[in-house]
């Protein structure tokens, strides 16, 4: 079976138009919610962390990357049930012995405080009040993000150097 | 921990951005090249397969999914050095004993012919002439893809299937 890929109807971060002027803002797809400069998709169903990463990827989005405590708080305020947990884009890198965001950056000690083990196959999820680590094979809900931004003329190719 | 489904965490329609008319076409971001209906980004640096998957995801894209032999040939024609290899979005699922695309579909026997072992921790890369399997921990270049399509006025979740 071929990889049946749904067409992406809009790339909200980087694509630029050839001919007509681009509007300043694009809106979020159905099922997604705008939060500041991002569109967030809070899944209803559950997946292991790797499958969650892949699901966001095939939706041309990313598992949630949290910039700072304010963004963490804003996101947690959208979780209306204490019993619900969501995978985010952070897991433990055994080779580097550190928590690593899926964009390659490391967790700063000033950022999220993670409750739980920092060991192989540990991935991070958030609840209404806390940030925890759990075996990546555990099935949980997840949050995908798309950046919702003004188009920049030059996109930095840092990772392609 | 067994995740509770609990209450819906967000309203799927609130906080939608108001938009102006959308342009008819989107083109590829800087550093990406258009190939048929896709934008492709060939990395310069190397990564293990998992990190490559994560990198594409944070670029709001996917590791390359190849629909058929024609697309394989078109992609290989863009590789100008016999010695260069690129991870694609295909790896071996031990539990399902089959090659699996990251969107969840399985490799059809009529599609790519993979040279190498089909075993745990095997991931697939392409070169100028062939398709190989290798330990996923091996560092290689990789290819990200974004779908490039006409934009519809109403963002339809068809694209998220």
């Amino acid at each position: 079976q071929k990889p049946s890929i749904g067409k992406c109807s809009v790339d909200i971060q980087q694509n630029r138009t050839k001919t007509t002027e681009r509007p300043d803002l694009l809106n979020c797809p159905i099922y997604w919610q705008q939060v500041q400069e991002k569109c967030l998709l809070f899944s209803h169903t559950v997946n292991p962390w790797n499958n969650s990463l892949a699901d966001c990827s095939t939706k041309e989005s990313s598992l949630l990357l949290i910039q700072d405590k304010d963004e963490l708080t804003r996101t947690q305020n959208l979780i209306h049930d204490k019993a619900i947990s969501f995978w985010i884009g952070l897991n433990f890198s055994l080779s580097e012995k550190n928590w690593k965001w899926i964009n390659g950056s490391f967790l700063s000690s000033n950022d999220l405080k993670i409750t739980g083990d920092a060991k192989e196959n540990s991935c991070v999820y958030i609840s209404q009040t806390s940030v925890y680590s759990e075996y990546c094979s555990t099935e949980m809900k997840w949050i995908c993000q798309k950046e919702l931004t003004l188009v920049r003329n030059k996109v930095s190719p840092d990772s392609w150097l | 921990q067994k995740p509770s489904i609990g209450k819906c965490s967000v309203d799927i329609q609130q906080n939608r951005t108001k938009t102006t008319e959308r342009p008819d076409l989107l083109n590829c971001p800087i550093y990406w090249q258009q190939v048929q209906e896709k934008c492709l980004l060939f990395s310069h640096t190397v990564n293990p397969w998992n990190n490559s998957l994560a990198d594409c995801s944070t670029k709001e894209s996917s590791l390359l999914l190849i629909q058929d032999k024609d697309e394989l040939t078109r992609t290989q024609n863009l590789i100008h050095d016999k010695a260069i290899s690129f991870w694609i979005g295909l790896n071996f699922s031990l539990s399902e004993k089959n090659w699996k695309w990251i969107n969840g579909s399985f490799l059809s026997s009529n599609d790519l012919k993979i040279t190498g072992d089909a075993k745990e921790n095997s991931c697939v890369y392409i070169s100028q002439t062939s398709v190989y399997s290798e330990y996923c921990s091996t560092e290689m270049k990789w290819i990200c893809q974004k779908e490039l399509t006409l934009v519809r006025n109403k963002v339809s979740p068809d694209s998220w299937l």
Epitope: E139 | C8, I12
Partner: antibody, heavy 121, light 107 residues
Framework: EVQLLESGGGLVQPGGSLRLSCAAS????????MSWVRQAPGKGLEWVSA????????YYADSVKGRFTISRDNSKNTLYLQMNSLRAEDTAVYYC??????????????WGRGTLVTVSS | DIQLTQSPSSVSASVGDRVTITCRAS??????LAWYQQKPGKAPKLLIY???SLQSGVPSRFSGSGSGTDFTLTISSLQPEDFATYYC?????????FGGGTKVEIK
């Protein structure tokens, strides 16, 4: 062609067992949570059970909890419903259903034709 | 569990009529509501999801509205092929629940 095809229905005595199957084709089965929904003759729709895409998480309606087991084999693109201790009130057409989006349990955009289960002595 | 109450349970209408069906949830479900059409001997068909989004291929005479606890399905101009039973379904919480159905009959 995108489709779901149920099988395994039939006539069974109260207390008996049946195993329903749902063969999926034309879409990436392993990406989606799947559900079984039933409809008793002349009645409305009743959700029965759901299973996550990877198969590790399952949910059941109270009316079937402890008697029915949902499972899936992603390598075979097949969904199952093992029904034990069947009762007369389980008589219904059983549908398997796929959600519109891989992040959702419901909003079913694809249904099978259904398979009839009759529980009678 | 979230209960969904549909009204009316049946409605008699003529071709060209505007038909409105309502669905009330026992607690707030934001916009997590879908509507289905079912004809005798057939599987249900998704018409509307996320309260107001029209499913691909569904005629534009069908529309949905509402959020929270009160939702409406409207058929702006009834066509012969629209005589069927309509169900609402909530996707906010498991267990997934359906309304009791509304049968649209020919007057």
């Amino acid at each position: 062609e995108v489709q779901l095809l149920e099988s395994g229905g039939g006539l069974v005595q109260p207390g008996g067992s049946l195993r329903l199957s749902c063969a999926a084709s034309g879409f990436t089965f392993s990406q989606y949570a799947m559900s079984w929904v039933r409809q008793a003759p002349g009645k409305g729709l009743e959700w029965v059970s759901a299973i996550s895409a990877a198969g590790g998480t399952t949910y059941y309606a109270d009316s079937v909890k402890g008697r029915f087991t949902i499972s899936r084999d992603n390598s075979k693109n097949t969904l199952y419903l093992q029904m034990n201790s069947l009762r007369a009130e389980d008589t219904a057409v059983y549908y398997c259903a796929k959600p519109l989006d891989s992040s959702q349990w419901a909003d079913f955009d694809l249904w099978g034709r259904g398979t009839l289960v009759t529980v009678s002595s | 569990d979230i209960q969904l109450t549909q009204s009316p349970s049946s409605v008699s209408a003529s071709v060209g009529d505007r038909v409105t069906i309502t669905c009330r949830a026992s607690q707030g479900i934001y916009s997590w509501l879908a509507w289905y059409q079912q004809k005798p001997g057939k599987a249900p068909k998704l018409l509307i999801y996320a309260a107001s989004s029209l499913q691909s291929g569904v005629p534009s005479r069908f529309s949905g509205s509402g959020s929270g606890t009160d939702f409406t399905l409207t058929i702006s101009s009834l066509q012969p092929e629209d005589f069927a039973t309509y169900y609402c379904q909530q996707a906010s919480d498991l267990p997934i629940t359906f309304g009791g159905g509304t049968k649209v009959e020919i007057k």
